[in-house]
Interface confidence: low
């Protein structure tokens, strides 16, 4: 089982849409797959997929999940708020037939404030 997550870095404006993609590859066929998205270590959602269907469509605040067989899990945040900034990780585990798990790399989401003044101040606050 392997999980590839993207993009590594995503910078979007407040009020727009952010799309995080997780590709789950498994050599053998599975009957039930558990998936999980976390933000800064906290679980946003932990649905399972069976017969090509997600058990849950909502994932955290303003988050929508979709599954495109055979391997693509998408988390769509719309509209994006400043609170959505953080480190997102996709995790997957085959539960049936064989218990096996894998985790993606971090996607760092940066949300720019809608107010250009706030945006300028925020960028200036970075060290260096």
């Amino acid at each position: 089982l392997s999980v590839q997550q993207g993009p590594n870095l995503l910078q979007v404006r407040q009020g727009s849409q952010a799309t995080l993609v997780c590709q789950v590859d498994q050599a053998t066929a599975w009957e039930r797959l558990r998936v999980k998205w976390t933000k800064d270590g906290a679980i946003l959602c932990q649905p399972y997929i069976t017969n090509g269907s997600l058990s849950l469509g909502v994932c955290g605040p303003q988050g929508r999940l979709s599954w495109q067989a055979p391997s693509h899990l998408t988390l769509q945040l719309d509209p994006v708020s400043l609170n959505h900034s953080g480190a997102y990780v996709c995790w997957a585990a085959v539960e049936i037939p064989e218990l096996e798990e894998a985790e993606g790399n971090i996607t760092r989401l940066f949300v720019d404030p809608d107010d250009p003044t706030q945006n300028r101040n925020r960028i200036a606050s970075f060290p260096g």
């Epitope: 009957e31 999980k36 932990q46 399972y48 995790w91 539960e95 049936i96 037939p97 218990l99 798990e101």
Partner: antibody, heavy 126, light 108 residues
Amino acid sequence: QVQLQQSGPGLVKPSQTLSLTCAISGDSVSSNSAAWNWIRQSPSRGLEWLGRTYYRSKWYNDYAVSVKSRITINPDTSKNQFSLQMNSVTPEDTAIYYCASDVVLESSSSRHFDYWGKGTLVTVSS
Amino acid sequence: EIVLTQSPGTLSLSPGERATLSCRASQSVSSSYLAWYQQKPGQAPRLLIYGASSRATGIPDRFSGSGSGTDFTLTISRLEPEDFAVYFCQHYGGSPRPFGQGTKVEIK
């Protein structure tokens, strides 16, 4: 409440085959959410998972690499039990052998050994 | 292959004291697949904690589990006489499904 009843000889000669059986009550060996495991424990190796059998529309087996070439775990649906066979045993295989069940919980991805047999001490000696 | 290392090997405490047992994985593991077992002489192991922090059915709330990544902890808030035993951690995501070598909690 699942109960697991172990049976089999306590003494096996070196190079011979160790055979143990685990009878299940309170669940079915063909359950779509359970798996049926063998685990052993010795002072030198500690607790060691050996392998399992489970049914998910068809039968699957999964073995620890350390014993994969020597063991077979088979279900017996007619008797609702499963067995362990380990061939070419040596004194290093002397241990307490346990059967145990684990279950996939619908509400989470956790899976764990929740029911155990009482254990069978198997001594490999001539 | 994941290796689980438990510490200390032996913990000598008195009834009523707090016990803190550590389990360290050789690589990061999902907390969803970390369990703790208790074993008394002549008995099979008994499941205490699964998913790193969920208590199994019938386990008193003085037992608690925590941790993530590579470091996991079993805490017994106030030791009762029946709690003196050997405790094992185990990782059960995929195979093999390794156990730690155990921590013995003995009466001081």
